[in-house]
Interface confidence: low
């Protein structure tokens, strides 16, 4: 099981109009016709990647202003792993299997990405983070 | 301007935050496609240049002017072209200036 | 570096389907953007992210991505939509961007 679902941010966080508008099953938020899931536990990337999978998504993979600035909210203070990996001799990949274009600075020289509300970043992968899940309605 | 000459080409925004932003150049030769040319970070510690520029053509920017710049140099009659700046925003170019037409020619 | 090859030249009759390609080596790995560029403009982004439309762009259009191939389709197609369009993708080891050659689209 991935987990109950919680925001661990530290602030206070309306949510966006259409979240309760949604096809997302109980415990995720609906958003920009997408569902995410926000882990209560940390794990490491991968591990949190296999949570994501067996519910039918992947570590989040984020293609829009919109879903960049609903998951920084989100997140808050905590570092929250997603969807962007780079392996050796290879470019970034999100966990969708598209090549990353660049859109937004990762700091950091590490391989797995992280955000929280100030900062998208990357960290070594074994390192234990909270998560963040998405995957298309249905 | 003629052959072997050169030229800086400016491009001044407005309305968003300019240092957040990574800006490119993207020409269009007349009758022809868009090409890019050039592209820079918002902090200017990234340029990157098409193959057929590199060498020849510098960016910059200034961002307490809010101004992206082109140094054009060694220009040869194929760089004729409309140079549009563009905003490369989410990895689309979602904001493009008017267009300044670039003449080589003896 | 990738290279993106379109057709240069597609027609349909008005209220029909029409078609652009785009296509260049495993594109379907990377994200591809179309742009409709009329006479004396600056291009316009139409499709996004494959498939992403920007606020203000008509539901007839759309895009797809896989494989080789990339496709803007625009439904119901209308005079005004006659313009040449362009695919944009991005090598991503050096962030150079690759615009594909233009289609000219001719509404009959």
């Known amino acids: 099981s991935v987990g109950q679902y919680n925001c661990p941010g530290q602030y206070t966080f309306s949510m966006p109009s259409d979240s309760h508008v949604s096809s997302c099953s109980e415990d995720w938020v609906g958003y920009q016709r997408k569902c995410y899931f926000i882990s209560t536990v940390k794990r490491s990337w991968t591990s949190a990647q296999n949570a994501c999978s067996e519910h039918g998504a992947t570590l989040a993979v984020i293609d829009s202003e919109k879903d960049m600035n609903f998951l920084k909210r989100y997140a808050g203070r905590e570092e929250h792993w997603v969807g962007l990996k780079k392996e050796p001799g290879h470019p970034w990949k999100w966990s969708n299997g598209k090549e990353f274009n660049n859109w937004f600075n990762v700091t950091g020289s590490d391989k797995c990405v992280f955000l929280k509300n100030t900062e998208v970043s990357s960290m070594e992968c074994e390192k234990n983070l909270y998560w963040i899940c998405n995957k298309p309605y249905k | 301007v003629q052959p072997g000459g050169s030229l800086r080409l400016s491009c001044a925004a407005s309305?968003?935050?300019?240092?957040?932003?990574?800006m490119h150049w993207v020409r269009q030769a007349p009758g022809k496609g868009l090409e890019w040319v050039s592209s820079?970070?918002?902090?200017?510690?990234?340029?990157y240049y098409a193959d057929s520029v590199k060498g020849r053509f510098t960016i910059s920017r200034d961002n307490s002017k809010n101004t992206l710049y082109l140094q054009m140099n060694s220009l040869r009659a194929e760089d004729t072209a409309v140079y549009y700046c563009?905003?490369?925003?989410?990895?689309?170019?979602?904001?493009w200036g008017q267009g300044t037409l670039v003449t080589v020619s003896s | 570096d990738i290279e993106l090859t379109q057709p240069p030249s597609v027609s349909v009759a008005p209220g029909q389907t029409a078609r652009i390609s785009c296509s260049g080596d495993?594109?379907?790995?990377?994200?591809v953007y179309w742009y409709q560029q009329k006479p004396g403009q600056a291009p316009v982004v139409v499709i996004y992210?494959?498939?992403k439309r920007p606020s203000g762009i008509p539901e007839r259009f759309s895009g797809s991505n896989s494989g080789n191939t990339a496709t803007l389709t625009i439904s119901g197609t209308q005079a005004e939509d006659e313009a040449d369009y362009y695919c944009?993708?991005?090598?991503?080891?050096?962030?150079?961007?690759?615009f594909g050659g233009g289609t000219k689209l001719t509404v009959l």
């Open positions: 820079i970070s918002g902090s200017s510690s990234s340029t």
């Open positions: 944009q993708s991005y090598t991503s080891f050096t962030t150079k961007i690759v």
């Open positions: 309305g968003f935050t300019f240092s957040n932003f990574v």
């Open positions: 495993s594109l379907g790995s990377k994200y």
């Open positions: 563009a905003r490369y925003y989410y990895a689309s170019f979602d904001y």
């Open positions: 992210g494959d498939s």
